[in-house]
Structures are given as C-alpha cells and as structure tokens.
C-alpha cells in the first residue's frame, strides 16, 4: 500500500522538515527559514511561532518542530501550548478581573496562579484537623477523631466565610 501510494503521490516521500514544491515539479524542498513541517508529505511549511513581548522562547523553532514559548518572570502560562501569559500573584492571593486580591478567610492559594480554594473540611472525610489552614496553605487532615488516643484534642477550623460580599470573585 505504501509503495502504491508513493507511485501515485510523489509528495508522500517528502520527509518532515521539507515540503512538496508544486512549483518545482513536486520535488521535496527544505522548509524556508522560520518555518517547519512536523510530518511528512506536507505541501507547505508552517510559519514558526514567535515568542515576543511577555512570551519568551523555551524551545527554538527547527525545520521539523515549532517554537515553544513560556512566560517572562512575574507571569505564568495559560491555555494549551501557553497561548496566553497571565500575571502572577503572591501565594495567599488570587488574580481577579480587578487585580490580585487576598484570599478570604477559610480559603487558600498555595501557588502564584489560580484561585483561592476553600480549606478541606476534614470531618467530611472522617478525619480530624492536624494543622490549621492559612491563606497560603490548606488544612492538614489527620486520623479520624476515633483513632485519637483518649485526652488528645484536635483543632477544628471555623467554617469558611460564605457572605456574598466576601466570596472570591
């Protein structure tokens, strides 16, 4: 089948890094500078992605693979293939449409990206709180209260604030 296809379509012989040049009797021509073809049999080469502005180059473009970008310090990637760079916040904060905001009581964010999340409610998983939560850290759950030796106490954090005015937006 492969041999038959090759006889019918000379372009199928063109390897990655080349394209089938219709202007030159369908011979395999190397991709021009700043372009690539990642698969064989291509009739054109794709333009390399350029990592400009807040994007920086993580991997240079080659004749067979596109460039890969990441973000400059103070920003992080969003989306497949780092399609966007988004501003970092501090741990204990989240980025809202109005900028970085501290996590409300009862929520945490242990990263520079993403949202403030509610502390884990250990009791719902049949466990007790070993370490209280903070704006930067989730609570640490331990063994179930029944597993604790007599006289041992567990710390239970107050329920997360749920007033509409305090919920992270």
């Amino acid at each position: 089948f492969e041999r038959t296809r090759s006889l019918q379509d000379p372009c199928s012989n063109c390897p990655a890094g080349t394209f089938c040049d219709n202007n030159r009797n369908q011979i395999c021509s190397p991709c021009p500078p700043n372009s690539f073809s990642s698969a064989g049999g291509q009739r054109t080469c794709d333009i390399c992605r350029q990592c400009k502005g807040v994007f920086r180059t993580r991997k240079e473009c080659s004749s067979t693979s596109n460039a890969e970008c990441d973000c400059t310090p103070g920003f992080h990637c969003l989306g497949a293939g780092c399609s966007m760079c988004e501003q970092d916040c501090k741990q204990g904060q989240e980025l809202t449409k109005k900028g970085c905001k501290d996590c409300c009581f009862g929520t945490f964010n242990d990263q520079k990206r993403g949202i403030c999340r509610p502390w884990t409610n250990c009791s719902l998983d049949g466990k007790s709180v070993l370490v209280n939560g903070t704006k930067e850290r989730d609570v640490v759950c331990g063994p179930s209260p029944a597993d604790l030796s007599p006289g041992a106490s567990s710390v239970t954090p107050p329920a997360p604030a749920r007033e509409p005015g305090h919920s992270p937006q």
Partner: antibody, heavy 120, light 106 residues
Framework: QMQLVQSGAEVKKPGASVKVSCKAS????????MHWVRQAPGQGLEWMGW????????NYAQKFQGRVTITRDTSASTAYMELSSLRSEDTAVYYC?????????????WGQGTLVTVSS | SYELTQPPSVSVAPGKTARITCGGN??????VHWYQQKPGQAPVLVIY???DRPSGIPERFSGSNSGNTATLTISRVEAGDEADYYC?????????FGGGTQLTVL
C-alpha cells in the same frame, strides 16, 4: 496522549455504596485537581466535588456532603469517587474531569463516563 | 447559591450564526467556560475564560461575557455543531453549571 479511563458500569441496590475509579495517564497526575461531575438521564451536568491529587485535600458540593468521598492513589495515578446511601435518583453517568489552567476552574479533559444504575 | 440560566433550546439554519446565552448575577465579574456535549459522549471544553479557545476548537466558536450575560457564539453553523451546550463558572466554593441548551441545526 492524555487520557482518563473510568471503571465499568455498575448496578446497585438502594442503600448500597458505589466506588468509581478514574485512571489518569499522559500527564503529571499530581499537578492537576480532579473533579467529579454527574449527569442523570436526560438531565444537565451536576458538580460533585474535587480532590487535590498532591495533598489529598477535597471540596464537596453541599448537596453531596456526608454521602460522597473522593480519594486518590498517587502510585496508581487514580482518583476514586465513592457515593453511599444510594437512592434511585442517583442513577446517572458519573464523569471524572481534570481541571485545566484557566483562572476559574475549567475542566479540560473528561473520562468516558461510568453509568451507575440504582434499582431494587 | 449562584444560579446560571440558559435557554432550553436554540435553532439555527446551517451557515447562519447561533448565539447561546448564559445569565447570572454580575456574571461579567466571573470567568465563564463553555462545554459541548453530543449524545452518548462526554462533554468537551470549547471556550474557557470567557473567550479563549482550546487547541483543536474551530475559530467559528467564540465567547463574550459582560454585565449579567455571557454568550457563546457559533458562526457558520454546521450540522456537526448540533449538541447540548453548558456554561460553567466557579462561585465561592463550588463549580456551577447552567441547565444546558440544545442546539438544533435545521
């Protein structure tokens, strides 16, 4: 490539429990929160909760608190959802879904779904 | 708890533009995600963070979000776009889905 493969269909009696598994491959399991979402026949999507595969921390929808437990086994790159005290209205397709990178919890990859039928 | 309202159904002729709305109190301050679900299949993310498209999703799919309404717009609608569409937001401590909209291609 990235894949979430769920366990097979289950038939349960009212009052019983069911435990559905979701095996992840093709990405760093501990790097992304895992959510569970269910869909009753002919109905919409209903969020149940999440697990942080790194820490084991959880968050559950109020409706399911006390009946659902979401856990994970990092060595097996697998998340589990256990629902207890089943009733007929729990008959649904249960999906695991990986949280993506957007600012406000998008679910960018989904398992194929597991049908749980509750019938006496 | 936060609620999202979608029209149960929207009909559109092939080649035309479909607009599916998602209403919620001050939804413009939140990030909205949209999913497409075809019969017997798992949902697929088609728009995230109001208006961004995951790789592999056609440019015909776009989104907007302001005030009390988010909108998923599908231009040059094709028969293969016929599906249920769900909006979704994060609110305080839970993930919230809209009721879903069935898109029918006439």
């Amino acid at each position: 490539q990235m894949q979430l493969v769920q366990s097979g269909a289950e038939v349960k009696k009212p009052g019983a429990s069911v435990k559905v598994s979701c095996k992840a491959s093709g990405y760093s399991f501990t790097g992304y929160y895992m959510h569970w979402v269910r869909q009753a026949p002919g109905q919409g999507l209903e969020w149940m909760g999440w697990v942080n595969p790194k820490s084991g921390g959880t968050n559950y929808a109020q409706k399911f608190q006390g009946r659902v437990t979401i856990t994970r086994d990092t060595s097996a790159s697998t998340a589990y959802m256990e629902l207890s005290s089943l009733r007929s209205e729990d008959t649904a397709v249960y999906y695991c879904a990986r949280e993506g990178w957007a600012r406000r919890i998008d679910l960018d990859e989904w398992g194929q779904g597991t049908l749980v039928t509750v019938s006496s | 708890s936060y609620e999202l309202t979608q029209p149960p159904s929207v009909s559109v002729a092939p080649g035309k533009t479909a607009r599916i709305t998602c209403g919620g109190n001050n939804i413009g301050s939140k990030s909205v995600h949209w999913y497409q679900q075809k019969p017997g299949q798992a949902p697929v993310l088609v728009i995230y963070y109001d208006s961004d498209r995951p790789s592999g999703i056609p440019e015909r799919f776009s989104g907007s979000n302001s005030g009390n309404t988010a909108t998923l717009t599908i231009s040059r609608v094709e028969a293969g776009d016929e599906a249920d569409y769900y909006c979704q937001v994060w609110d305080s401590s839970s993930v919230v889905f809209g009721g879903g909209t069935q898109l029918t291609v006439l």
